[in-house]
Interface confidence: medium
Amino acid sequence: GWVWNQFFVPEEMNTTSHHIGQLRSDLDNGNNSFQYKLLGAGAGSTFIIDERTGDIYAIQKLDREERSLYILRAQVIDIATGRAVEPESEFVIKVSDINDNEPKFLDEPYEAIVPEMSPEGTLVIQVTASDADDPSSGNNARLLYSLLQGQPYFSVEPTTGVIRISSKMDRELQDEYWVIIQAKDMIGQPGALSGTTSVLIKLSDVNDNKPIFKESLYRLTVSESAPTGTSIGTIMAYDNDIGENAEMDYSIEEDDSQTFDIITNHETQEGIVILKKKVDFEHQNHYGIRAKVKNHHVPEQLMKYHTEASTTFIKIQVEDVDEP
């Protein structure tokens, strides 16, 4: 019968000929009366056999990631009779893995959106690298993830590639972050190869800023001839938030005379001071009113950012009109 052990050849061997093992018949007494032959894909080009001894050699550099095993056939012939000594047999040469592939992130580019002020531990995104090396061969394809850029705001779980928030972030200070993640094979041991990816993390706005008046004092004038409903001027607050989180409503906080009103222009986010009752210079030639401004939409959990609405004082001078 045939005698052989399992055949392994390391990939990427640079020698011109690498001895893999020996195929022989147990009828071979070593007197060179048998001839061994190799058949199948790779026979003669990738692998050769010593016809006399049955020793098999790899004569080409192999790449396991291209082809991890070769199925060949062996024959042994009695030189004197030309007959097969053993039935033709199939055998396998396995290409054994070396760590010659770095981890690669295949789903690049990564981009994630997370609300600002999210608590520590909030999941942002999972990045996954793949390694073409053999996962069953030692640690060649066992990966560890680490953060190269992004501290102290982000962390990555070493074995899963899950990125989490590790420190609260304020969109109004910085609205996006570039995080660089490294994946290292060999679980980080010497000889490890690595790959990196960038993750763009954008912060979405939450309503964590209240509107604040640009001025603590506004000065307006109104003619005593102005009819009710006249717009006598505008006031403006600013809000560091964006979108609907920056929409605001103006109102009168204090006007003992009940002479003025404030309406909100929702397109410009300005407050328009309106004359509610006609004024008379001879009766009262100036007024002081206090206005306040609040956001339109404030979720309950964000009310803590909106205590004490911003207020401003408006000095309104009545202009005299000569009466006939």
């Epitope: 000065r219 009262q284 100036h286 007024y287 002081g288």
Partner: antibody, heavy 119, light 107 residues
Framework: QVQLVESGGGVVQPGRSLRLSCAAS????????MDWVRQTPGKGLEWVAV????????YYADSVRGRFTISRDNSKNTLFLQMNSLRVEDTAVYYC????????????WGRGTLVTVSS | EIVLTQSPGTLSLSPGERATLSCRAS???????LAWYQQKPGQAPRLLIY???SRATGIPDRFSGSGSGTDFTLTISRLEPEDFAVYYC????????FGQGTKVEIK
């Protein structure tokens, strides 16, 4: 030091003119409305005129309207009162005063300059 | 214009005593826009109270203001030697007018 210092007062004949100045220091002059207030032994304290922080609006007491002009130079932190066609009843100590941001009361006054109108 | 009338014209008191000064307006003062000033001889007026009852910065708490509409009061709870002066009320709800003053003198 936050202060207002008036100057330019003196003795003048009726019908003549005088220009008062008020030098401000120690605060952001260009942010405040400024007023002139005068004090006579007979009438007590009397408001004279106001000018808004940027000079855009000016208002006067009926007793001086058309004769007095209030102005300011924010680059020099100075308030002025040009007094024309002076009358005997304009005799008074003239104070410049700073209006607060919230309302029309005066939180800072100068020490005053005396104007005497006499023939 | 709104006329402010202060009473009494003169108040003779000793240090440590309580002083109560009155200011009455000829018509209602809107939004309690009333201030009190102290003036000593040769000096400029000094703001004590605004908004009828709010103490200005640096004013001791022995000074207090009250009132609304047409009747306002300045109270000095315990007179100190430096409190003897002339006190003026001012309305700033419609133009600016002052009372004629109340002199607080040492008895």
């Amino acid at each position: 030091q936050v202060q207002l210092v008036e100057s330019g007062g003196g003795v003048v004949q009726p019908g003549r003119s005088l220009r008062l100045s008020c030098a401000a220091s120690g605060f952001s002059f260009s942010s405040y409305d400024m007023d002139w207030v005068r004090q006579t032994p007979g009438k007590g304290l009397e408001w004279v005129a106001v000018i808004w922080y940027d000079g855009s609006n000016k208002y006067y007491a009926d007793s001086v309207r058309g004769r007095f002009t209030i102005s300011r130079d924010n680059s020099k932190n100075t308030l002025f009162l040009q007094m024309n066609s002076l009358r005997v009843e304009d005799t008074a100590v003239y104070y410049c005063a700073r209006e607060t941001g919230e309302g029309w009361y005066f939180d800072l006054w100068g020490r005053g300059t005396l104007v005497t109108v006499s023939s | 214009e709104i006329v402010l009338t202060q009473s009494p014209g003169t108040l003779s008191l000793s240090p440590g005593e309580r002083a109560t000064l009155s200011c009455r307006a000829s018509q209602s003062v809107s939004s309690s826009y009333l201030a009190w000033y102290q003036q000593k001889p040769g000096q400029a007026p000094r703001l004590l109270i605004y908004g009828a009852s709010s103490r200005a910065t640096g004013i001791p708490d022995r000074f207090s203001g009250s009132g609304s509409g047409t009747d306002f009061t300045l109270t000095i709870s315990r007179l100190e030697p430096e409190d003897f002066a002339v006190y003026y009320c001012q309305q700033y709800g419609s133009s600016w007018t002052f009372g004629q003053g109340t002199k607080v003198e040492i008895k």
